[in-house]
């Protein structure tokens, strides 16, 4: 779970160790603060959870670049 | 204002070492930035070397800097750049930069003026 | 790793200039920054965030893009416009190889 310390700044300290389908993911986004220990991904799934990752595991990157994809193709 | 300078460059030999610091004013370190090392071969592009964070020092480097460069907050507004086994490929301006804010997507809003580094036998 | 193209472009004053710059995997839609350098000078950054401004940077300077595909452009064209520009992603802090772009030198007649 992503832990927010003096917000906004929110940081990973762990990472799932489960791949998640791109199915059920809606959103993510990139934890880059020099305030935090690691650098991540928190992923945000269809029912609102919030999971950090290991922006080094290529799922993780897959599944940034699917939803990317998904961002930048217009739903018609 | 705020104000990176970079100083320590100079001629060395090829397996020589330096170490360069850069100073800040005008801001403290307990604003929470990252703070990198950039260089610059005559005529060439940027290369990013090495990040630290002002606030809790963690440490980034690029490949081919690892185990040969180590960057390192020396004090509340300087930050160093430890060189060994320099080689001719070394010889750069090293710029000293600092994020705009705590996030590494927002670029580097403060830059140094450089400091020459000159790798010759 | 960061592809800039092209290398070089000249352009006339009041033109309008556009540099591309290709990410070799995706790094979404807001995470690069767009230098402008002059000889003898440091970087100074224009763009953030793929297209925020810089604090006091003319809004002649447009960035946009997402994935792996993002622009500059540089309309009205002045003669200070000479420089050599510069991307850099801002996706990853991990991976600080080939951050910058090679970078595209612009030349105003």
């Known amino acids: 779970q992503p832990d927010a310390i003096n917000a906004p700044v929110t940081c990973c300290y762990n990472f799932t160790n489960r791949k998640i389908s791109v199915q059920r993911l809606a959103s993510y986004r990139r934890i880059t603060s020099s305030k935090c220990p690691k650098e991540a991904v928190i992923f945000k799934t269809i029912v609102a959870k919030e999971i950090c990752a290991d922006p080094k595991q290529k799922w993780v990157q897959d599944s940034m670049d699917h939803l990317d994809k998904q961002t930048q193709t217009p739903k018609t | 204002q705020e104000q990176l300078v970079e100083s320590g460059g100079d001629l060395v030999k090829p397996e020589g070492s330096l170490t360069l610091t850069c100073t800040a004013s005008?801001?403290?370190?307990?604003?929470?930035?990252?703070m990198c090392w950039v260089r610059q071969a005559p005529g060439k592009g940027l290369e990013l070397i090495a990040c630290i964070s002002s606030s809790i020092g963690v440490t980034y480097y690029a490949s081919w800097a690892e185990g040969r460069f180590t960057i390192s907050k020396t004090s509340s507004t300087t930050v160093t750049l430890q060189m060994t086994s320099l080689t001719v490929a070394d010889t750069a301006t090293y710029f000293c930069?600092?994020?705009?804010?705590?996030?590494?997507?927002?670029?580097?809003?403060?830059w140094g003026p450089g400091t020459l580094v000159t790798v010759s036998s | 790793d960061m592809t800039q193209t092209p290398a070089s472009v000249e352009v006339g004053v009041g033109g309008t200039v556009t540099i591309k710059c290709q990410a070799s995997?995706?790094?979404?839609?807001?995470?690069l920054s767009w230098y402008q350098q002059k000889p003898g000078q440091p970087p100074k950054l224009l763009i953030y965030?793929?297209?925020t401004l810089a604090s006091g940077v003319s809004s002649r300077f447009k960035g946009s893009g997402s994935g792996t595909q993002f622009t500059l452009t540089i309309s009205g064209v002045e003669c200070a416009d000479s420089a050599t520009y510069y991307c850099q992603q801002g996706a990853t802090i991990s991976y600080l190889d080939n951050a910058f772009g090679g970078g595209t030198e612009v030349v105003v007649k």
């Open positions: 930069a600092r994020t705009t804010d705590d996030n590494w997507n927002v670029g580097f809003n403060l």
């Open positions: 995997q995706s790094i979404g839609n807001r995470y």
């Open positions: 005008g801001f403290s370190f307990s604003t929470s930035y990252w």
């Open positions: 965030g793929t297209s």
